[in-house]
């Protein structure tokens, strides 16, 4: 069954996903899609790259990491709830049926609101709801905290600036990995 | 999926205060978000506000802040709105309803309590 | 607040016949919408949920549909189990908000 990750409303969330390439330089083709993984492809492909590039991506999905080095983790900015479901992140490994699969379940949460401490005044007063660093266990993500109920566009910026990039260190012993060659 | 059982009805007077049950079973009560509704004859749904069993976390409706109250008792497995100063317009049925497995607010729902507000 | 407008409030139709209803919301909701199902004098049943997805054991005749602001929710070969009222709710942001409601009756 698929590992499950959280986060909360408004945060960024992370979908870890790694290969290891045979050399360096020699991708792989790699989708994401919102669904189980199908039989061929991804459904509802929300990112692609081919054997250089990322070549085709949709608003508010990214790779993070270094997907040269195999690292082709989806970040997911700014979730809502209906951002929940079941990814598909698929390996195209070239011949017949040799494409790795994982299915990987993102449950989005309501923010939480976290009282500010007084040393944080300034920020809280245009962000009244405080970040925080909630951990979910060694199974699923670890996300920014919560977010006030502002603007979307505010809401992205904030979560872009303020991203940890100490998370993908953290899950990728927990993510799904493979090694090719 | 679970189940989500509401009382039928409670009858109050003007001023008073009342406290609604919503018992769950037949899943992790402390995993779902619970909502609670108001639904008053010819004048639609109204949310009243949210809270996670978890923690006791709530989020309300501005317009129900001071009026409304939601409460746990994870022991039991019960959900609680409590509502203070009743007055005529208090008079509706209120439902419980839990979220879904991909965060769905308002999967499965209670069978309602109907809130008579009357001397 | 998000308002959201369902239309229509009412409407007449046949056993078979497939409807559409439509709710509009005063902004963006980025598919946190939901379709929840109210028979007389009885409590909801949720429909879809994320704009598209259905609740477990919704048949597969219901369906729903939309991006942005304006979301449907549609019936195909309607039974007689489906003459009820239908309401949409938007949970993308506090206080989430539902739609006035559309009532389906047998012509």
């Known amino acids: 069954s698929e590992v499950e990750y959280r986060a909360e409303v408004g945060q960024n969330a992370y979908l870890p996903c790694f290969y290891t390439p045979a050399a360096p330089g020699n991708l792989v083709p790699v989708c994401w899609g919102k669904g189980a993984c199908p039989v061929f492809e991804c459904g509802n492909v929300v990112l692609r790259t081919d054997e250089r590039d990322v070549n085709y991506w949709t608003s508010r999905y990214w790779l993070n990491g270094d997907f040269r080095k195999g690292d082709v983790s989806l970040t997911i900015e700014n979730v809502t709830l209906a951002d929940s479901g079941i990814y598909c992140c698929r390996i195209q490994i070239p011949g017949i049926m040799n494409d790795e699969k994982f299915n990987l379940k993102l449950v989005i949460k309501p923010a939480k609101v976290t009282p500010a401490p007084t040393r944080q005044r300034d920020f809280t007063a245009a962000f009244p709801r405080m970040l925080t660093t909630r951990g979910h266990g060694p199974a699923e993500t670890q996300t920014l905290g919560s977010l006030p109920d502002i603007n979307l566009t505010q809401i992205s910026t904030l979560a872009n600036e303020l991203r940890d990039s100490r998370l993908a260190n953290d899950l990728r012993d927990s993510g799904a990995t493979i090694r090719i060659g | 999926q679970g189940q989500l059982q509401q009382p039928g009805a409670e009858v109050v007077k003007p001023g008073a205060a009342v406290k609604l049950s919503c018992k769950a079973s037949?899943?992790?009560?402390?995993?779902?978000?619970m909502q609670w509704i108001k639904q008053r004859p010819g004048q639609g749904l109204d949310w009243i506000g949210e809270?996670?069993?978890?923690?006791?976390?709530?989020d309300y409706n501005q317009n129900f802040k001071g009026k409304a109250t939601l409460t746990v008792d994870t022991s039991s497995n019960t959900a609680y709105l409590q509502l203070s100063s009743l007055t005529s317009e208090d008079s509706a049925v209120y439902y419980c309803a839990r979220e879904g497995a991909f965060s769905s607010p308002f999967a499965y729902w209670g069978p309602g309590t109907l809130v008579t507000v009357s001397s | 607040d998000i308002l959201m407008t369902q239309s229509p409030s009412s409407m007449s139709v046949s056993l078979g016949d497939t409807v559409s209803i439509i709710c509009h919301a005063s902004?963006?909701?980025?598919?946190?919408i939901g379709w929840l199902q109210q028979k007389p004098g009885k409590s909801f049943k949720g429909l879809i949920y994320?704009?598209?997805n259905l609740e477990d054991g919704v048949p597969s005749r219901f369906s729903g549909s939309g991006s942005g602001a304006d979301y449907s929710l549609t019936i195909s070969s309607l039974e007689s189990e489906d003459f009820a009222d239908y309401y949409c709710?938007?949970?993308?942001?506090?206080?989430?908000?539902f739609g006035g409601g559309t009532k389906l009756e047998i012509k």
């Open positions: 709710v938007q949970y993308v942001q506090f206080p989430r908000t």
């Open positions: 809270i996670d069993p978890s923690d006791n976390y709530t």
């Open positions: 037949g899943y992790t009560f402390t995993s779902y978000w």
């Open positions: 994320h704009g598209t």
């Open positions: 902004q963006d909701i980025r598919s946190n």
